[in-house]
Interface confidence: low
C-alpha cells in the first residue's frame, strides 16, 4: 500500500480581516492510525492552531466530521481573521505512540495572507502659520494595512502635488504596515480657501480610495496692507483720517492710532468684510479737530495682526496758519466702516 501523503492543495490563501479562512488538508490513507494537528510556522517555535485529539480551539472549526468513519478531509476554518493570523499553516499527521504520538508527515504548507484596510488617513499641518510664498509641510498617516502594496497621492485643490516623500514601515515582512508621507506646499495669497488632500489606494478598498484633508486656512497668515488717507470734510476745522486695512487673514487684528507718536486710541477689529478669496478688510477712522493743534500732526495707524510684530502707516496732517491762531479741544470719534471687497 502506498505511504500516506498529506496534501495541502493551496500554496496560499488571502482573506480579508474579519472574515473566516478555510485551510484545506487531505490524507491519501487512513494508515497509520493517529491524530492530525495544524501548526502555524515550522520548527521548534511553531504555534499549535488545532489538535484533533484534545484541547479547546474556539476560533477553529473542522470542515468535515473528523470522527466519521473513513474521513480523509482534515480542512479547518479559522474565524474572525486579523493581520496577526498571517503566516504559513502546516497540516501534520502523527502516528499513535506510547507515551507520546510521533510526528509522521507534514503537508507542504499554506501561506495565509490577510488583507487589512488602511485606517482613515490623518492629515496634519504645520504648528505655526506661514505667509504666502513660503513652503509648509503637511503629513499624512495611515496604519494597519496589509499587504504592503499601497499608493499615496497628494492634491491641492484637485491638482496633484509632486514634492513629497513617503515611507512604508516596517521595511521587512510584518502582519500589518503603516504609511507616512510628508508633502511640501508653497502657499499663495489665495490659499485661505485651499485644501490639501492625501489619497490612499489599496487592494482592500476596491478602487474607492480613502482621503484625508487639511485646510490651508489653518496654515496660512496673510499680512494686511495699510492705507491712510484724509477724507473731505464740510467743516473746515475738522479732519477725517481713515486707515484701510486690507486683505488679511486670520481675523485677529488690533489697531492703534497715534498722534505725534502718542497713543490716541486702540481698538480690536470686530465687524469685518470678507473678500472672495477669504481674506478680510476693515476700516477705522479718526476725526481730528484741527483747531486744537498749532503745529502739523503726524497721525499713525499701527496694526498688530495675529500676534505678529506691528506694522504701521503714517499720514502728515497739515494745520493751516489760520487754524494755528485759534486753539480749541480735540475730539476723537471711532467708527467701524464697512468697505466693499477689493
Amino acid at each position: 500500500e502506498d505511504e500516506l501523503q498529506v496534501i495541502q492543495p493551496e500554496k496560499s490563501v488571502s482573506v480579508a480581516a474579519g472574515e473566516s479562512a478555510t485551510l484545506r488538508c487531505a490524507m491519501t490513507s487512513l494508515i497509520p492510525v493517529g491524530p492530525i494537528m495544524w501548526f502555524r510556522g515550522a520548527g521548534a517555535g511553531r504555534e499549535l492552531i488545532y489538535n484533533q485529539k484534545e484541547g479547546h480551539f474556539p476560533r477553529v472549526t473542522t470542515v468535515s466530521e473528523l470522527t466519521k468513519r473513513n474521513n480523509l478531509d482534515f480542512s479547518i476554518s479559522i474565524s474572525n481573521i486579523t493581520p496577526a493570523d498571517a503566516g504559513t499553516y502546516y497540516c501534520v499527521k502523527f502516528r499513535k505512540g506510547s507515551p507520546d504520538d510521533v510526528e509522521f508527515k507534514s503537508g507542504a504548507g499554506t501561506e495565509l495572507s490577510v488583507r487589512a484596510k488602511p485606517s482613515a488617513p490623518v492629515v496634519s499641518g504645520p504648528a505655526v502659520r506661514a505667509t504666502p510664498e513660503h513652503t509648509v509641510s503637511f503629513t499624512c498617516e495611515s496604519h494597519g494595512f496589509s499587504p504592503r502594496d499601497i499608493t499615496l497621492k497628494w492634491f491641492k485643490n484637485g491638482n496633484e502635488l509632486s514634492d513629497f516623500q513617503t515611507n512604508v514601515d516596517p521595511a521587512g515582512d510584518s502582519v500589518s504596515y503603516s504609511i507616512h508621507s510628508t508633502a511640501r506646499v508653497v502657499l499663495t495669497r489665495g490659499d485661505v480657501h485651499s485644501q490639501v488632500i492625501c489619497e490612499i489606494a489599496h487592494i482592500t478598498l476596491q478602487g474607492d480610495p480613502l482621503r484625508g484633508t487639511a485646510n490651508l486656512s489653518e496654515a496660512i497668515r496673510v499680512p494686511p496692507t495699510l492705507e491712510v488717507t484724509q477724507q473731505p470734510m464740510r467743516a473746515e476745522n475738522q479732519a477725517n483720517v481713515t486707515c484701510q486695512v486690507s486683505n488679511f487673514y486670520p481675523r485677529g487684528l488690533q489697531l492703534t492710532w497715534l498722534e505725534n507718536g502718542n497713543v490716541s486710541r486702540t481698538e480690536t477689529a470686530s465687524t469685518l468684510i470678507e473678500n472672495k478669496d477669504g481674506t478680510y478688510n476693515w476700516m477705522s477712522w479718526l476725526l481730528v479737530n484741527t483747531c486744537a493743534h498749532r503745529d502739523d500732526v503726524v497721525l499713525t495707524c499701527q496694526v498688530e495682526h495675529d500676534g505678529q510684530q506691528a506694522v504701521s502707516k503714517s499720514y502728515a496732517l497739515e494745520i493751516s496758519a489760520h487754524q494755528k491762531e485759534h486753539g480749541s479741544d480735540i475730539t476723537h470719534e471711532a467708527a467701524l466702516a464697512p468697505t466693499a471687497p477689493l
Partner: antibody, heavy 123, light 107 residues
Framework: QIQLVQSGPELKKPGETVKISCKAS????????MSWVKQAPGKGLKWMVW????????TYADDFKGRFAFSLETSASTSYLQINNLKNEDTATYFC????????????????WGQGTLVTVSA | DIVMTQSQKFMSTTIGDRVSITCEAS??????VAWYQQKPGQSPKLLIY???NRYTGVPDRFTGSGSGTDFTLTISNMQSEDLANYFC?????????FGSGTKLEVK
C-alpha cells in the same frame, strides 16, 4: 552598487519602431520609481514619463503621449521604452533615471542615471 | 507647464573664479529645484536638490540658493573639471521641466 544599464545605440528609418531597455541592479526594482528623459543632440533635457514600478502605472508628459509606450519586466528588473512610427525629431539620447525616494513617492530629483541610449532616425 | 529659464547659454570663466548660474521659474516652485552637471557624452550628475542641499560627495565649492522663482548655483572656486553644462530642474508640478542649460567655458 546601484547601476542602471541601458541597451546599445539604434539606427532606424522613419516609420519604424524601436524598443530600448534599462536594466537595474543593486536594489529592489519595485521599491523605486523610474523616469525616462530625452536629450536631443546639443539640446537640453526633457522629462518624458515616470513609472510607478510597484503598480506599473505611468505618468506621462503631454508631449510623449501616443507614439511612446513604457513597460516593465519586474522579474528582470528592467524598464522599456518603445517608440512607434519613428520621426526624425525622435533622434536623441534617451536616459532612464531612478527616483531618490524609497517606495511610493512621486519622482523628484534624479541621483542614478543610465548611460543613455542614442537613437538615430534617418532615411 | 512651468518654464525654467537659464538666460545665459554660455559663460566664460577663469580657473579660481566665483561663478553664479541663475535659473528662473515661470511660477512659484518653492524649493523643489535640483541642479545637474553634464559633461559631453556623459549622463547628468546630481549636484544640488531641494534648492540648497548638496548631494553626497559633491565638493563644497558648489552651493545652491533661492526659493520661490529665482535660483542660483554658485561655484566658489572654479576648477578645470567644472567646465561642463549645468541644468536646473523643477519637481514642484507635472510635467517636470529642466532649464535649457548654461555651458561654462574657459576664457
Amino acid at each position: 552598487q546601484i547601476q542602471l544599464v541601458q541597451s546599445g545605440p539604434e539606427l532606424k528609418k522613419p516609420g519604424e519602431t524601436v524598443k530600448i531597455s534599462c536594466k537595474a541592479s543593486g536594489y529592489t526594482f519595485t521599491t523605486y520609481g523610474m523616469s525616462w528623459v530625452k536629450q536631443a543632440p546639443g539640446k537640453g533635457l526633457k522629462w518624458m514619463v515616470w513609472i510607478n514600478t510597484y503598480s506599473g502605472v505611468p505618468t506621462y508628459a503631454d508631449d510623449f503621449k501616443g507614439r511612446f509606450a513604457f513597460s516593465l519586466e519586474t522579474s528582470a528588473s528592467t524598464s522599456y521604452l518603445q517608440i512607434n512610427n519613428l520621426k526624425n525629431e525622435d533622434t536623441a539620447t534617451y536616459f532612464c533615471a531612478r527616483d531618490p525616494h524609497y517606495y511610493g513617492s512621486s519622482p523628484a530629483w534624479f541621483v542614478y542615471w543610465g548611460q543613455g541610449t542614442l537613437v538615430t532616425v534617418s532615411a | 507647464d512651468i518654464v525654467m529659464t537659464q538666460s545665459q547659454k554660455f559663460m566664460s570663466t577663469t580657473i579660481g573664479d566665483r561663478v553664479s548660474i541663475t535659473c528662473e521659474a515661470s511660477q512659484i516652485v518653492g524649493i523643489a529645484v535640483a541642479w545637474y552637471q553634464q559633461k559631453p557624452g556623459q549622463s547628468p550628475k546630481l549636484l544640488i536638490y531641494s534648492a540648497s542641499n548638496r548631494y553626497t560627495g559633491v565638493p563644497d565649492r558648489f552651493t545652491g540658493s533661492g526659493s520661490g522663482t529665482d535660483f542660483t548655483l554658485t561655484i566658489s572656486n572654479m576648477q578645470s573639471e567644472d567646465l561642463a553644462n549645468y541644468f536646473c530642474q523643477q519637481y514642484s508640478a507635472y510635467p517636470f521641466t529642466f532649464g535649457s542649460g548654461t555651458k561654462l567655458e574657459v576664457k
